[in-house]
């Protein structure tokens, strides 16, 4: 039986049940390399409290559909008096990066995971030439996730004092230049995640090979190497390589530019101070507020919730968008879709799509950007579920009693972008460091 998601096969992935202090290792095509789980375990559960291991999914007992992967075991479990077997169930959804398996819940018998990944899309539009896992768990099992930094198009310029060269990088995947045929970036070879431009020539100085690593709690490392043989003539016989160290700052700050800290014989060392390197709970909340000692800030968008069936309306040329954020009030137009953002076609108001649902909500404050994300909307033809990204700006003089109003800014591959100027986005910082 062929592997259902070949792009995910090269790595052993991790997921965590934080509530119960459980680390899962997942290898969807072969087996995880953990002796205590046996030679054919595809899903190995490590109970950190008791320091014990159990296989909760056997690679031999795999069954797959386009969107669901199940690994059974021969271990019995008692669920309401019936004799079941322990199993793991991974639900796959289309995403724009390789993504990460997320632990959902576990019963006596079944361990449930969800994975939004390019590997599950119906079309290849989001697939990279080369991409590696872009998250890591630290020793306290806290997740550090750089997926939001991955550019699907374009690159980051590395700050370098050399006026004759430009070093471009992407995070965890190769650079896609197709959307910008006119720039210097266009000359970069396919597959490169680190591209050095000198004059009119561009050179591959590194491709992703291994996933993100944690060196200590607040420092993450990504290494790129040039896969091709054939040395570059300006590298003095050495093979090019790039090391990017992502550093979580000691207190809240605006984002910074990746900086070249050392360069020798085509070995490039880059340091990037960014809050995306911090653990995810520092940056994100499933509610509409971020506060407390853990986050160093106080943000509360709940006053933006609309009551009494009214919604914010944002004009998107062909479409009208109805938004009801930070609540669970049904949008009247949206046919009981549990939508936080609802897209209605102006020329045919019966064409209604959920562009993100209110129970799929993430509030993120990172590198000075405050963003509210709604995902899990109606599917597009690619298989990607529509989602909405609302970028908030602090405006103490916003109209509508300080609430302001969302403005639709555009759509990229079934992701809808809005900006929203409001006094409720004015962030209060706690300086307790």
């Amino acid at each position: 039986q062929a592997a259902p998601f070949p792009e995910l096969c090269s790595y052993t992935w991790e997921a965590v049940d934080t509530k119960n202090n459980v680390l899962y290792k997942i290898n969807i095509c072969g087996s995880v390399d953990i002796v205590q789980c046996g030679p054919s375990s595809a899903v190995c559960m490590h109970l950190l409290k008791t320091r014990t291991y159990h296989s909760v999914g056997d690679s031999v007992l795999r069954s797959a559909t386009r969107s669901l992967l199940e690994f059974n075991t021969t271990v019995s479990c008692d669920q309401q008096g019936t004799n079941h077997r322990v199993q793991s169930s991974i639900a796959f959804l289309c995403g724009k990066t390789l993504g990460t398996p997320e632990f959902v819940t576990a019963t006596e018998c079944v361990h449930y995971f969800e994975w939004r990944t390019t590997a599950a899309c119906k079309k290849d539009i989001f697939k990279a030439n080369k991409e590696v896992p872009c998250y890591v768990f630290d020793e306290e099992l806290r997740k550090h996730d750089l997926n939001p930094l991955i550019k699907l198009s374009g690159a980051y310029l590395v700050d370098d004092s050399d006026p004759d060269t430009s070093l471009f990088i992407n995070v965890c995947r190769d650079i896609d230049t197709l959307r910008d045929p006119g720039s210097q970036l266009r000359a970069c070879p396919p597959g490169t995640a680190a591209c050095l431009v000198r004059g009119h020539q561009a050179f591959d100085v590194g491709q992703p090979r291994d996933g993100l690593k944690v060196v200590r709690k607040d420092r993450l490392v990504l290494s790129y190497v040039r896969e091709e043989a054939g040395k570059l003539d300006f590298c003095d016989g050495h093979s090019p390589a790039v090391t990017i160290t992502f550093v979580c700052p000691s207190e809240r700050r605006e984002g910074t530019i990746p900086k070249l800290t050392a360069k020798s014989n085509c070995r490039y060392e880059i340091e990037w101070i960014t809050e995306y390197a911090c653990h995810r709970d520092y940056l994100e909340s499933k509610t509409c507020s971020l506060s407390g000692e853990q986050q160093d800030v106080s943000i509360d968008l709940t006053p933006l919730a609309q009551s009494g069936g009214s919604s914010y309306i944002s004009d998107g040329k062909e479409y009208l968008f109805y938004l009801n954020v930070c609540g669970e009030t049904e949008i009247q137009f949206c046919n009981k879709k549990q939508a936080a953002v609802c897209q209605v076609k102006k020329s045919d108001t019966s064409q209604v799509k959920a562009a993100g649902r209110y129970h799929n909500q993430t509030l993120r404050y990172s590198d000075g950007d405050l963003t509210l994300i709604y995902f899990g909307g109606d599917e597009c033809s690619s298989g990607f579920q529509r989602m909405s990204v609302i970028n908030f700006e602090c405006n103490k003089t916003a109209g509508n009693d300080g609430k302001g109003t969302p403005v639709f800014t555009g759509e990229v591959d079934c992701t809808y972008f809005f900006t929203w100027d409001t006094e409720y986005a004015c962030v209060h910082h706690h300086h307790h460091h």
């Epitope: 550019k151 310029l157 910008d180 045929p181 720039s183 266009r186 970028n391 700006e393 990229v412």
Partner: nanobody
């Protein structure tokens, strides 16, 4: 690829103000970072100001800091450059440009350009 069209240039006295506009069409507004550049006769094209697509973060050339303001109206797919306290040395053709590179002010990293609009500041 995105298409850009500048407007708003003209002749103004030193100390005066102008507001340049740049309307974008074609590819989506949302995947690009935006910049204003200028080129005076016989000189290289130089960076003036930039704004990131994903937020309203801005950067400015030292020579215009405090006098020029870059902004955008996403609903209209338009970038603006508000120029106050203009000086004769601000005389140039002003170009709007779009880039898929984050954190850059280098004109060669901008793949889409407008035709430019002339700004002349008389003393």
């Amino acid at each position: 690829q995105v298409q850009l069209q500048e407007s708003g240039g003209g002749l103004v006295q030193a100390g005066g103000s102008l507001r340049l506009s740049c309307e974008a069409s074609g590819r989506t507004f949302n995947t690009y970072n935006w910049g204003w550049f200028r080129q005076a006769p016989g000189k290289e094209r130089e960076f003036v100001a930039a704004i990131r697509w994903s937020s309203s973060k801005t950067s400015y050339a030292d020579s215009v800091k405090g006098r020029f303001t870059i902004s955008r109206d996403n609903a209209k797919n338009t970038i603006y450059l508000q120029m106050n306290s203009l000086k004769p040395e601000d005389t140039a053709v002003y170009y709007c440009a779009a880039s898929i590179v984050d954190f850059t002010t280098n004109p060669s990293h901008f793949g889409s350009w407008g035709q430019g609009t002339q700004v002349t500041v008389s003393s």
